[in-house]
């Protein structure tokens, strides 16, 4: 029967007693980096292709014994994942070895530097199709790791690493915190994160996505027909590949952030118990589990949007948080979440041509989020419209006055330490969906956009008082653009999107014992591109 | 024994070319900066990855590394130039001892200078 | 009117241990980040480490890291700063800070400690 | 040597305008906030300036900010004698996770 890992990845349309899905990815070129592999392995004969190189460092110890089965057990089994016949993911992916980790699994930085180096001097020797990179490594945060694989990545090439099977902040490894690089962390069969000994997967806002890592049945380098069943980030990353390549096989044109967002978008939502996080990683960590897309073709039609945190800003109120999309993303919207409520809003600005997301840190120490929302919006023309506060009126507002935008988002970011004891709160006026409402002594940040067919509205869910959390969710065929709150005041820690619902978290008045009146309500602005709807039936 | 000989070939070259005029005065501006594994084990003290600024050309990367060798020798150092990057990252990695760091950092193009350190399966 | 009081500087060898204290008042210390900043005799400015107001984050240089801790007992109004394996570079004023770089900033009078053999 | 590069000495006469400079990178002044702070002979640092250009109650509208880029500037105008200090700037660097300070600036009256 069809391997537990197989299985999870593969829509129910697919589903077989065989894993067969449509074309294996014949179009895609896999590089591994790693150790040295039994390339005449049954799973993975004349599908992989062992380049000459090696850049590894000695093994550790002095009566160290190189045994072949050992020294190609971790990349024979990758590629197994990656490309075998019976247990593979994407069966029709070609693949080339590098080896730059030794018997012992161990590499350095510079000798995976230099294996990036040769990948891009052979894409620019003789062009193929697209290319993955599958780095099942990790190591302390490195710089120059991260620019490299930034590089490569700016060059058209997909790199899928491993999290890291520390139980620790992937942002705290590399090549798992280099933003360009598709980051996996590894579940198990139950869609518990994997526990690996003492340790397991990492977690958190460097990881995008989760895939199966726990006794995957792949290649074993004991003999030529064996099987072994290994657990780790790295067999993750390899499944993740394995569909990139499936992906790319089928539409070779994707780019890396289109690749990214279909990703996340056909993942498995919300599968994953939480609770094996430590509770500050919790809402950072994305509950995502990769899938195969239920058909090939016929995604275009959807805007794609992703969640990115920023990294926290640090305790002083000096420290600002950033949340970046990625360059062909848009910034549709941004957000800002502070688990102690001590915040100042947040907005969105220009920086070096671009649309950033900033969040201000107020008193205490505690430090505040930025979090973007990331869209693919195809020849959008999107600009943010502010409105500095009001002052005496009853609220600050701000719309959206060009002819043909929309607004896909609301920020507002305020001086005063605390909105809470500034009243009155804002009561949002209805039937007026292109405008953005807020506190009187707060500025207001417009995101207004212009895209062939882009249509959007607002969507609002309020409870009397502050409950510890209010949601609103897009309904099917719409993807939310934007999330915020109303009123912006200290009982509201901030909002957030979760896939297409919009998260607003408070301080429960429970637990603080106030006797507020205010209701807080969760602001949705959801989207739909007709244009695009058109342009995938005019195709089919 | 090959490789100190190796060693002092490229000793003996880098002296001439610094004679020969090859490198050029250091720039003055923003200093570069160091970065080291915060994981203490995992680091690898003795090579170091110099990484230039984006728009250093193959041939300015290996002028600056034969002036960090140069330099160096006059100081009673011996280095080794592993490998000259191109293609991805401008820049070079070098074995050398880290009392030279302060002076490498000086170096004209040079954007950060990074310890090398251990990767590992996962 | 805030007041930052700081204590226990003195001398002390290379390699050992001393703790600081800051005892705070005129506010509602539990609200604030406070931090410790150094200034080396003749020198600059040094951050040495913050922590937030209900104590649960803490950040520190990286000349301190693994060498002092710093922590807070709110319902004594006091900051503290152990120091260990101290070293003669961190000869010292000492000022206790609360919320660096935001309206609400404010600096004891320092204690000045010295590491010397 | 300080992340953040500020000139040694400035002077200048009374009544005259004095303007003293940090220039720091994108992991600091470029992405958050700068302080600046006074510093009188024998006493505890005095905050000056906060969020680039915000004047705390009781400081004189002497006294200013002002950011660009990765620089900031705080300019004395109307210089007394009792402005003679240590000037330092400060701010918070992302990618140190720390607080970091200029090297001082020795502001002499003349």
């Known amino acids: 029967s069809i391997p537990w890992n197989l299985e999870r990845i593969t829509p129910p349309r697919y589903r077989a007693d065989e894993y067969q899905p449509p074309d294996g990815g014949s179009l895609v070129e896999v590089y591994l980096l790693d150790t040295s592999i039994q390339s005449d392995h049954r799973e993975i004969e004349g599908r992989v292709m062992v380049t000459d190189f090696e850049n590894v460092p000695e093994e550790d110890g002095t009566r160290f014994h190189r045994q072949a089965s050992k020294c190609d057990s971790h990349g024979t089994h990758l590629a197994g994942v990656v490309s075998g016949r019976d247990a593979g993911v994407a069966k029709g992916a070609s693949m080339r070895s590098l080896r730059v980790l030794n018997c012992q699994g161990k590499g350095t930085v510079s000798g995976t530097l230099i294996g990036l180096e040769f990948i891009r001097k052979s894409q620019l020797v003789q062009p193929v199709g697209p290319l993955v990179v599958l780095l099942p490594l990790a190591g302390g945060y490195s710089r120059v790791l991260n620019a490299a694989c930034q590089r490569l990545a700016r060059a058209g090439v997909v790199l899928v690493t491993a999290a890291g099977n520390f139980r620790d902040d992937a942002c705290l490894y590399s090549p798992a915190s280099a933003p360009e690089v598709i980051t996996v962390g590894a579940t198990n069969a139950q869609d518990q994160p994997v526990t690996l000994g003492t340790l397991g997967t990492n977690f958190g806002r460097c990881v995008d996505l989760f895939a199966p890592g726990e006794d995957i049945i792949g290649a074993s380098s004991d003999c030529s027909t064996c099987f072994v069943s290994q657990s780790g980030t790295s067999q993750a990353a390899a499944h993740v590949a394995g569909i990139a390549a499936m992906m790319l096989s089928a539409e070779p044109e994707l780019t890396l952030a289109e690749l990214r967002q279909r990703l996340i978008h056909f993942s498995a939502k919300d599968v994953i118990n939480e609770a094996w996080f430590p509770e500050d990683q919790r809402v950072l960590t994305p509950n995502l589990v990769a899938a195969l897309p239920p058909s090939t073709h016929g995604a275009g039609w959807q805007l794609f949007c992703r969640t990115v945190w920023s990294a926290h800003s640090g305790p002083t109120r000096m420290a600002t948080a950033i949340a970046r999309c990625a360059p062909d993303e848009e910034l549709l919207s941004c957000s800002s979440f502070s688990r102690s409520g001590k915040r100042r809003g947040e907005r969105m600005e220009a920086q070096g041509g671009k649309l950033v997301c900033r969040a201000h840190n107020a008193f205490g120490g505690e430090g505040v989020y930025a979090i973007a929302r990331c869209c693919l919006l195809p020849q959008a023309n999107c600009s943010v419209h502010t409105a500095p506060p009001a002052e005496a009126s009853m609220g600050t507002r701000v719309h959206c006055h060009q002819q043909g935008h929309v607004l896909t988002g609301c920020s507002s970011h305020w001086e005063v330490e605390d909105l809470g004891t500034h009243k009155p709160p804002v009561l949002r006026p209805r039937g007026q969906p292109n405008q953005c409402v807020g506190h009187r002594e707060a500025s207001i940040h417009a995101s207004c956009c212009h895209a062939p067919g882009l249509e959007c509205k607002v969507k609002e869910h309020g409870i009397p008082a502050p409950q510890g959390q209010v949601t609103v969710a897009c309904e099917e065929g719409w993807t939310l653009t934007g999330c915020s709150a109303l009123p912006g005041t200290s009982h509201v820690l901030g909002a957030y999107a979760v896939d297409n619902t919009c998260v607003v978290r408070s301080r429960d008045v429970s637990t603080t014992g106030s006797t507020s009146e205010e209701a807080v309500t969760a602001v949705a602005i959801c989207c739909r591109s007709r244009h695009l709807a058109q342009a995938s039936q005019e195709l089919q | 024994q090959e490789d100190e000989d190796g060693d002092y070939e490229e000793l003996v070259l880098a002296l001439r070319s610094e004679e020969d005029g090859l490198a050029e005065a250091p720039e003055h501006g923003t200093t570069a900066t160091f970065h080291r594994c915060a994981k203490d084990p995992w680091r690898l003290p003795g090579t170091y990855v110099v990484v230039l600024k984006e728009e250093t050309h193959l041939s300015q990367s290996e002028r600056t590394a034969r002036r960090l060798q140069a330099q160096a020798a006059r100081r009673g150092y011996l280095t080794k130039i592993l490998h000259v990057f191109h293609g991805l990252l401008p820049g070079f990695l070098v074995k050398m001892s880290g009392d030279l760091l302060e002076l490498a950092l000086k170096l004209p193009h040079v954007d950060y200078i990074e310890e090398d350190s251990s990767v590992f399966a996962q | 009117e805030v007041q930052l009081l700081e204590s226990g500087g003195g001398l002390v060898q290379p390699g050992g241990s001393l703790r600081l204290s800051c005892a705070a008042s005129?506010?509602?210390?539990?609200?604030?980040?406070m931090s410790w900043v150094r200034q080396a005799p003749g020198k600059g400015l040094e951050w040495v480490s913050t922590?937030?107001?209900?104590?649960?984050?803490?950040y520190y240089a990286d000349s301190v890291k693994g060498r002092f801790t710093i922590s807070r007992d709110n319902s004594k109004n006091t900051l503290y700063l152990q120091m260990n394996s101290l070293r003669a570079e961190d000869t010292a004023v000492y000022y206790c800070?609360?919320?660096?770089?935001?309206?609400?900033?404010?600096w004891g009078q320092g204690t000045l400690v010295t590491v010397s053999s | 040597q300080s992340v953040l590069t500020q000139p040694p000495s400035v002077s200048a006469a009374p009544g005259q305008k004095v303007t003293i400079s940090c220039s720091g990178s994108?992991?600091?002044?470029?992405?958050?906030?700068v302080s600046w702070y006074q510093q009188l002979p024998g006493t505890a640092p005095k905050l000056l300036i906060y969020?680039?250009?915000k004047r705390p109650s009781g400081i004189p509208d002497r006294f200013s900010g002002s950011n660009s880029g990765t620089s900031a500037t705080l300019g004395i105008t109307g210089l007394q004698t009792g402005d003679e200090a240590d000037y330092y700037c400060?701010?918070?660097?992302?990618?140190?996770?720390?607080?970091?300070f200029g090297g001082g600036t020795k502001l002499t009256v003349l």
């Open positions: 800070a609360k919320e660096v770089g935001s309206p609400f900033d404010y």
């Open positions: 005129g506010f509602t210390f539990s609200s604030y980040a």
């Open positions: 922590i937030s107001g209900s104590g649960g984050r803490t």
């Open positions: 994108n992991s600091n002044i470029g992405n958050n906030y």
């Open positions: 969020d680039n250009n």
């Open positions: 400060g701010t918070w660097d992302s990618s140190l996770s720390a607080v970091v």
